[in-house]
């Protein structure tokens, strides 16, 4: 069976301050079982943007019903974008465990923030 891939089709997205940004992510397999997390940046300084499993992420909504077991679309919308939101966003698949372990990351989508039109 082909190994799961994390696909982020957009290399970059540009959004005006105050608007919402949609970041696309799909996976190619339901295996291994485990949650998706979104991060801004890579490495130890990365910021957790969304965790499918736990936490409250008020500016983030999932584009599809990510809680459905057969779902493979983990795209998100981030509302009320500010300059501090600019950066590269990674959709990351985790393998279920205690604790969950990182399995595979998407290639990233760079979000740039334009000045709010006056």
């Amino acid at each position: 069976e082909e190994e799961l891939q994390v696909i982020q089709p957009d290399k970059s997205v540009s959004v005006a301050a105050g608007e919402s940004a949609i970041l696309h992510c799909t996976v190619t397999s339901l295996i291994p079982v485990g949650p998706i997390q979104w991060f801004r940046g890579a490495g130890p300084a990365r910021e957790l943007i969304y965790n499918q499993k736990e936490g409250h992420f008020p500016r983030v909504t999932t584009v599809s019903e990510s809680t459905k077991r057969e779902n493979m679309d983990f795209s998100i919308s981030i509302s009320n974008i500010t300059p501090a939101d600019a950066g590269t966003y990674y959709c990351v698949k985790f393998r279920k465990g205690s604790p969950d372990t990182e399995f595979k990351s998407g290639a990233g989508t760079e979000l740039s923030v334009r000045a709010k039109p006056s």
């Epitope: 301050a17 105050g18 801004r40 940046g41 490495g43 130890p44 300084a45 990365r46 910021e47 957790l48 943007i49 965790n51 736990e54 936490g55 409250h56 992420f57 008020p58 500016r59 983030v60 009320n80 500010t82 300059p83 501090a84 939101d85 709010k116």
Partner: antibody, heavy 119, light 108 residues
């Protein structure tokens, strides 16, 4: 209910060190960035430091850079502030504060820990 | 760095008399402004976020408005328990996170 409880405050001499702790409960601690904010006697609020949810990303106010170190232990739901080379002007009540999300305001505050630096 | 200037420094009002507090940013912060209340001897408490949204459990006599650089916190009918210092906080540009200098509200 979200609870943040600071401990470790006290009286120290200039040049000495102190470590503050903030015990968190009532929320998924490992999912949120955390901050330290201080308030000198009779003064306003001054942001001191921030740490991201995983603990690998930190930011500091210029006034404490190189002297203070923020850290966290997500397995213990605890936030720390290691304060070295303390100065009289570091005398303040130190509050830990939870962020609403990674790029946002502070939605919950601890009760504070008093740090007094005096010779 | 964005500087937040609050005015007036002190505001004295009678119970039931509208109180209006101002916070001005040195550059636009969009709607990314919060208000915190700090009563004497207590920790700060979040009142308003995103300029106009009341935090959980905050009475509706507190309201926030504004965007860009000029923001207002209004206490429509102040109660004696509203005596406190009120701080604005911006989170549009960071670090550092910035607070205003505070407005002390006294209820006569």
């Amino acid at each position: 209910d979200v609870q943040l409880v600071e401990s470790g405050g006290g009286v120290v001499r200039p040049g000495e060190s102190l470590r503050l702790s903030c015990a968190a409960s009532g929320f998924s601690f490992r999912s949120y960035a955390m901050n330290w904010v201080r308030q000198a006697p009779g003064e306003g609020l001054e942001w001191v430091s921030r740490i991201n949810s995983g603990g690998g990303g930190t930011d500091y106010a210029d006034s404490v850079k190189g002297r203070f170190t923020i850290s966290r232990d997500n397995s213990k739901n605890t936030l720390y502030l290691q304060m070295n080379s303390l100065r009289a002007e570091d005398t303040a009540v130190y509050y830990c504060a939870k962020q609403y999300d990674w790029n946002s305001f502070f939605d919950y505050w601890g009760l504070g820990a008093l740090v007094t630096v005096s010779s | 760095e964005t500087v937040l200037t609050q005015s007036p420094a002190t505001l004295s009002v009678s119970p039931g008399e509208r109180a209006t507090l101002s916070c001005r940013a040195s550059q636009t912060v969009g709607s990314k402004l919060a208000w915190h209340q700090q009563k004497p001897g207590q920790a700060p408490r979040l009142l308003i976020y995103d300029a106009s949204n009341r935090a959980t459990g905050i009475p509706d006599r507190f309201s926030g408005s504004g965007s860009g650089t000029d923001f207002t916190l209004t206490i429509s009918s102040p109660q004696t328990e509203d005596s406190a210092v009120y701080y604005c906080q911006q989170y549009y540009y960071w670090p550092p996170y910035r607070f205003g200098g505070g407005t002390k509200v006294e209820i006569k």
